[in-house]
Interface confidence: low
């Protein structure tokens, strides 16, 4: 079998809301993936599991099931949304994200995604990790690739 390529493209949009009493930030982050099937048979994207980390803490998880079928030598772009919550021990971020004196309230999030594909009963998992900028101070839509954060040292495996 040939490879199935998964490319994390970036954050497509981030929609933010706040709970003033709880000093909590809710961020709905929509990400984009390109999945390429280099095989001569169709492949089912069975599920996508994703999680978002801020400061080494998981702040959101999502799972999509029975997503699509990708034809032979074909590519599909898939969007998935991860609801995230910045609260409790990270409630100090509420002040930063709601500060009016600055225009852009970028925070660095680590996006982790695992795509499970199946063909004729055989499962394959492909994982990706990327650091991305997300503005926690307003609703934002991004040009694909615009939110990538390149200057972060990747933690050693």
């Amino acid at each position: 079998p040939r490879s199935i390529d998964v490319k994390y493209i970036g954050v497509k949009s981030a929609y933010v809301s706040y709970d003033v009493q709880k000093r909590t930030i809710y961020l709905n982050i929509t990400n984009t993936l390109n999945i390429t099937n280099n095989n001569y048979y169709s492949v089912e994207v069975e599920n996508i599991t994703a999680q978002v980390q801020f400061s080494k803490t998981v702040i959101g998880k999502a799972r999509l099931n029975n997503i699509t079928i990708i034809g032979p030598l074909d590519m599909k772009q898939i969007d998935y949304t991860v609801p995230t919550v910045i609260a409790e021990e990270m409630s100090y971020m509420y002040d930063f994200c709601t500060l009016i004196s600055i225009k852009v309230h970028n925070i660095v999030l680590m996006m982790q995604v695992t795509v499970t594909t199946t063909y004729f009963g055989h499962s394959e998992q492909i994982s990706q990790e990327r650091y991305q900028y997300v503005d926690c101070g307003r609703n934002t839509t991004y040009q694909l690739g615009q939110s990538e954060y390149l200057n972060v040292l990747q933690p050693q495996q």
């Epitope: 079998p1 001569y40 048979y41 169709s42 089912e44 069975e46 079928i69 034809g71 032979p72 030598l73 074909d74 199946t118 063909y119 004729f120 009963g121 055989h122």
Partner: antibody, heavy 121, light 112 residues
Framework: QVQLQQSGPELVKPGASVKISCKAS????????IHWVKQRPGQGLEWIGW????????NYNEKFKGKATLTADTSSSTAYMQLSSLTSEDSAVYYC??????????????WGTGTTVTVSS | DVLMTQTPLSLPVSLGDHASISCRSG???????????LEWYLQKPGQSPKLLIY???NRFSGVPDRFSGSGSGTDFTLKISRVEAEDLGIYYC?????????FGGGTKLEIK
């Protein structure tokens, strides 16, 4: 209900070509590939090849390259097989089939009704 | 091409009997992904074939549990316990592990 409805019987002369059809209904035509299988009278089954209607990619059994040409029309959810330079060896029932229910596990779980092609002068 | 050899060619049975059909492949049909794509089909007179068993031993949806498949490597068996009238027809094995995919020659299950 998922169905593959094939065109009617064909009587053709040696050396001629014939194009038979397989109309899909009850599912998204572009997402599942369609195979073609040959069955000569009183004989077994032979896999000819497949087409993936979503992008027109085809894959043939070497034995049928140059003999069979597979195409698909997504607007009418119909797959076609053209057989060229016909001889008596091409007289057979031709089936289209699809792995609709068992996409992850098996090859042909939905079969067409079959089209009889008779080559005779 | 992988040659699939079925025995017997004809299998006369009485209703209620057990039946066993053998299928032998000319080489191992374990796919590179570790699965064995051996399937069994039944073709009744004047009808299209129908899937019974996939991946050696898995019954397809709606197939009665009197049908069972077994085997590995190059030797495979389809067993029918308590044959019923609706089981009569020609049984084909099929391998989908190596292109071109190939069928066995068929075994005709008929009344004694």
């Amino acid at each position: 209900q998922v169905q593959l409805q094939q065109s009617g019987p064909e009587l053709v002369k040696p050396g001629a070509s014939v194009k038979i059809s397989c109309k899909a209904s009850g599912y998204r035509f572009t997402s599942y590939y369609i195979h073609w299988v040959k069955q000569r009278p009183g004989q077994g089954l032979e896999w000819i090849g497949w087409i993936y209607p979503g992008n027109g990619i085809t894959n043939y059994n070497e034995k049928f390259k140059g003999k069979a040409t597979l195409t698909a029309d997504t607007s009418s959810s119909t797959a076609y097989m053209q057989l060229s330079s016909l001889t008596s060896e091409d007289s057979a029932v031709y089936y289209c089939a699809s792995p609709y229910y068992g996409i992850r596990n098996c090859y042909f779980d939905v079969w067409g009704t079959g089209t009889t092609v008779t080559v005779s002068s | 091409d992988v040659l699939m050899t079925q025995t017997p060619l004809s299998l006369p049975v009485s209703l209620g009997d057990h039946a066993s059909i053998s299928c032998r492949s000319g080489q191992s049909i374990v796919h590179s992904n570790g699965n064995t794509y051996l399937e069994w089909y039944l073709q009744k007179p004047g009808q299209s074939p129908k899937l019974l068993i996939y991946k050696v031993s898995n019954r397809f949806s709606g197939v009665p549990d009197r049908f069972s498949g077994s085997g590995s490597g190059t030797d495979f068996t389809l067993k029918i316990s308590r044959v019923e009238a609706e089981d009569l027809g020609i049984y084909y094995c099929f391998q989908g592990s190596h292109v071109p995919w190939t069928f066995g020659g068929g075994t005709k299950l008929e009344i004694k």
